[in-house]
Amino acid sequence: DPVKPSRGPLVTCTCESPHCKGPTCRGAWCTVVLVREEGRHPQEHRGCGNLHRELCRGRPTEFVNHYCCDSHLCNHNVSLVLEATQPPSEQPGTDGQ
């Protein structure tokens, strides 16, 4: 069950996000998430993962890129990029949208 919390050994990760108590956290794995909200600059958040490991396997899109790793402070120096948007000439038709 991907929603069940992991109860294995914990790893220490760099924590840089609006959800961090301090500069490090302890979790089942480390995460880096790059998110771009509509009309805003992308923001990169680092932290710990305990639930929803399936997010680690998601492919990057133009709005989000999710990276996971499993060793001490492994998320500290990771930088992510978002998938480039397709140029208009290559986009499929959007009739009726």
Epitope: V3, K4, P5, E16, S17, P18, H19, C20, K21, G22, P23, N50, L51, H52
Partner: antibody, heavy 113, light 111 residues
Framework: EVQLLESGGGLVQPGGSLRLSCAAS????????MSWVRQAPGKGLEWVAN????????NYVDSMRGRFTISRDNSKNTLYLQMNSLRAEDTAVYYC??????WGQGTLVTVTS | QSVLAQPPSASGTPGQRVTISCSGS????????VYWYQQLPGTAPKLLIY???KRPSGVPDRFSGSKSGTSASLAISGLRSEDEADYYC???????????FGGGTKLTVLG
Amino acid sequence: EVQLLESGGGLVQPGGSLRLSCAASGFTFSSYAMSWVRQAPGKGLEWVANINQDGSEKNYVDSMRGRFTISRDNSKNTLYLQMNSLRAEDTAVYYCAREFDYWGQGTLVTVTS
Amino acid sequence: QSVLAQPPSASGTPGQRVTISCSGSSSNIGSNYVYWYQQLPGTAPKLLIYGNNKRPSGVPDRFSGSKSGTSASLAISGLRSEDEADYYCAAWDDSLNGRVFGGGTKLTVLG
């Protein structure tokens, strides 16, 4: 869009009980720790309690431990605060917050005889 | 009495730069991140600064945060009338195992 909507506030007599609810939407509720924070009329913010993502860890401010209980139902995307043995000094607006960024608009609890 | 100490009031004129201080201890500001919230009259608090000095998307760069030792400060440059609000600092406290807030600073924009 992240939304947190509190309900369950109202008028209660000293010694009475209330259960506050906070309905969350616009994000994966089960991925975030949640908090309750209160604000007495004309006063500052006071943290009440928090709960981790799966509900296995809870922390309370000392003055409310034993009287207040925080819980969550991830299947319903809802956070709760059960408040017992209420006192006049518990009168406040109670905010539900996603740690530590988004806040609901609050629900007013008034304890008076 | 709040665990984190803030001045009760601050003021400035439009265009000015104002700074609000927040003083704590080794168990909160000294070892954990500082957050700043803005509360406009009659509304819920809004996150302005997280992780000592980072702004969420949508918060103007007129707002900046800093931390040194067990103290922190919020600076607002190019002050505007809409900045008139209450400002709160917050941090996790390892000794209390809970979140602590400053008492709040009421910012008045003069003129």
